[in-house]
């Protein structure tokens, strides 16, 4: 998990003849808020699906009038980041599509008006936990600027935030077969365990220990199949010993959406449908005509010549909702189960898996462990769906064949000399340290600071870590 | 073998409505999307909407939205298409279509139930 | 809506004839095009899918081919159980749509 962050440094007119209009004027004032919209992939297949990655709206701009004459000049930005949070791992690759609005605030009928300025998209690759990228696009006379990146939030890190780190639970080491998270160097990584008998066909988890259910089935292990005849309410959370699902709280309780909308949950939050002459993100936009452009995706307005007078928007196919704001494909369907990113490619639908599922629709949980070998005595762990071999002292690599130099990543702390050995790797301290790592100081009176030297052993000799 | 087990044939009156069912056997019925298309006496085919059985999504035409209500029964594998405010344009044979081109390189066949002949008469 | 225009509606044919039924779509579909024969008081039965490939069990006699906005469906040698009436179908798009269909009658 983590979450992709966009700042936009700058709104204006691009270089070259032709300067844009100043989108504002005394009578229209107005303000400028963005969109964004994250795909995963590079490939043109990925720039038609939906945000899959996941949108996100800027706050309202300053409000802006137009000096009289003036050419546009930049144009008053919002203040923060916009923030889209990104639940399984980030792609690494990604398209984007950065829309610029203008909210105008002039006598309008029930409310303010919205109409796009600008829309600029692109493709790129970045690795989350890096520096901030800047950017610089144009679409047609405006121009602008932003930065952005992306970065993991804890426990995740790595370049994709696939990796899990957590506190060390012994001061010492981390786990068998588990490394220290680099930059995190006092954190292990931890491997993604479930809960344990968490059904493997209906539960999976995103963080250890838990056991979170698939659609239609429920109890703390996910091997409840939900019964709704008896339930009021199609929503958790659920009750393992019924199976039926008790009404919780959801994105739509209470109805955000304004003027008559009715909303239906999405994975990520709600969503309104909204009566004809109403649009926005909760049917707030009102009193519209067909002058203000109220279809999108190409939708044909007809009507609504005074606000009076109601519009309809005659949606082209593949578009639904009132202002034709849905785009409608199989996706829409949500074939893809287990996390997996649907495609629709017209002639046929595409699954792309998380890793540890296979089958047209994601539907096959893989058992990465059977017939892998671990060599040199390693054995296989599962994790998230991903085959690890946890290897033997003294051997590395995906399946253990490479013998490992244990001295290599310089373990012995403050000067101790790293010995390789057939059993791991031997520390010989430097004076004043003790520890399988040498990694305690010793206190001037002798005593060692945690944990004492075992019988037999004097602080600063060699001792075997097995 | 796949088999779509279609009910019965109705008469209605205007204004009522009819709720036909389509029972599935054969396959895992939660794989497929099911759609429903219709055919008036004489007439060519229209395609009403689609609903997947896994997770109750569905999608309608929109000539039919707010009238059309399609629902599943996963413990008896059944699909069934509710049609509201009938009139007598409504007058057709129902059918129950299994989706056929699904996913990409994997490719099952379409399959349709026996259809179900709804008349609409005062 | 992707309209889907077939020609022509009303086809006699011999058996051993070739005959060609084309569908025309109105805006580019890809090859998402399906071809069904229905017989009278029968549900329509799938014989090509993705434009050109032939579904399971279904005579070699029968080809489709066509991609973006014209299609067309091709039996090379008539039998007696091809005389039906044949369909298009786009499912590229929501809503799917069918075209108005072409009775092939005997001769």
């Known amino acids: 998990a983590g979450v992709f962050e966009l700042q936009i440094h700058s709104f204006g007119p691009g270089p070259g003849p032709g300067a844009p209009r100043s989108p504002c004027s005394a009578r229209l004032p107005c303000r400028l808020f963005f969109r964004v919209c994250l795909k995963p992939g590079l490939s043109e297949e990925a720039a038609e699906s939906p945000c899959a990655l996941g949108a996100a709206l800027s706050a309202r701009g300053p409000v802006y009038t137009e000096q009289p004459g003036a050419p546009a000049p930049d144009l008053p930005l919002p203040d923060g980041l916009l923030q889209v949070p990104f639940r399984d791992a980030w792609p690494g690759t990604f398209s984007f599509i950065i829309e610029t609005w203008r909210e105008e605030l002039g006598d309008q009928i029930g409310g303010p008006a919205w109409s796009l300025l600008a829309r600029v998209a692109g493709r790129r690759r970045l690795a989350a936990g890096g520096p901030w990228a800047r950017d610089i696009q144009r679409a047609g006379a405006w121009e602008l600027r932003f930065s952005y990146r992306a970065r993991c939030e804890p426990p995740a890190v790595g370049t994709a935030c696939t990796r899990l780190c957590r506190p060390r639970s012994a001061p010492s080491r981390c786990g068998p077969g588990l490394r220290p998270c680099a930059p995190l160097e006092d954190e292990c990584e931890a491997p993604l365990v479930c809960r344990a008998g968490c059904s493997p066909e209906h539960g999976f988890c995103e963080q250890p220990g838990e056991c979170r259910c698939l659609e239609g089935w429920t109890g703390p292990l996910c091997t409840v199949p939900v019964s709704t005849s008896s339930c009021l309410s199609p929503r958790g959370p659920s009750s393992a010993t019924t199976g039926c699902l008790v009404p919780g709280p959801g994105p739509c309780d209470g109805n955000p959406c304004a003027n008559g909308g009715s909303c239906s949950e999405t994975p990520r939050s709600f969503e309104c449908t909204c009566p004809r002459g109403f649009y926005g993100l909760r049917c707030e936009v009102s009193g519209v005509t067909c002058a203000d452009g109220p279809c999108f995706n190409g939708g044909l307005c007809v009507g609504g010549a005074d606000p009076d007078s109601a519009y309809i928007c005659h949606c082209p196919p593949g578009f639904q909702g009132s202002n034709c704001e849905k785009r409608v494909d199989r996706c829409s369907l949500q074939p893809c189960r287990n996390g997996g990113l649907c495609l629709d490619l017209g002639h046929a639908l595409r699954c792309r898996c998380r890793a540890g599922f296979a089958g047209p629709r994601c539907e096959h949980d893989l058992d990465d462990c059977a017939g892998r070998a671990c060599a040199n005595g390693g054995t296989c762990v599962e994790g998230g769906g991903a085959h690890r071999c946890s290897c033997a002292l003294g051997f590395g690599g995906r399946d253990c064949r490479e013998r490992a130099d244990p001295c290599a990543a310089r373990p012995c702390a403050h000067g101790g000399r790293c010995y390789a050995h057939f059993s791991g790797l031997v520390c010989a301290c430097a004076p004043g340290y003790m520890g399988a790592r040498c990694e305690f100081p010793v206190h001037p009176d002798g005593a060692s600071a945690l944990p004492a030297a075992p019988p037999g052993l004097r602080p600063g000799d060699p001792q075997r870590y097995l | 073998q796949v088999q779509l087990v279609q009910s019965g044939a109705e008469v209605k009156k205007p204004g009522a409505s009819v709720k036909v069912s389509c029972k599935a056997s054969?396959?895992?019925?939660?794989?497929?999307?099911m759609n429903w298309v219709r055919q008036a006496p004489g007439q060519g085919l229209e395609w009403m909407g689609v609903i997947n059985p896994y997770n109750d999504i569905t999608i309608y035409n929109q000539k039919f939205q707010g009238r059309v209500t399609m629902t599943v029964d996963r413990s008896t594998s059944t699909v069934y298409m509710e049609l509201s405010s009938l009139r007598s344009e409504d007058t057709a044979v129902y059918y129950c279509a299994r989706e056929g081109v699904l996913y990409d390189g994997y490719y099952e066949g379409a399959y349709w139930g026996q259809g179900t002949l709804v008349t609409v008469s005062s | 809506d992707i309209q889907l225009t077939q020609s022509p509606s009303f086809l006699s044919a011999s058996v051993g004839d070739r005959v060609t039924i084309t569908c025309k779509a109105s805006q580019n579909v890809g090859i998402a095009v399906a071809w069904y024969q229905q017989k009278p008081g029968k549900a329509p039965k799938l014989l090509i899918y993705a434009a050109s490939n032939r579904y399971t069990g279904v005579p070699s006699r029968f080809s489709g081919s066509g991609s973006g906005t014209e299609f067309t469906l091709t039996i090379s040698s008539l039998q007696p159980e091809d005389f039906a009436t044949y369909y298009c179908q786009q499912y590229s798009t929501y809503p799917y749509t069918f075209g108005q269909g072409t009775k092939l009658e005997i001769k």
């Open positions: 054969g396959y895992t019925f939660t794989d497929y999307f």
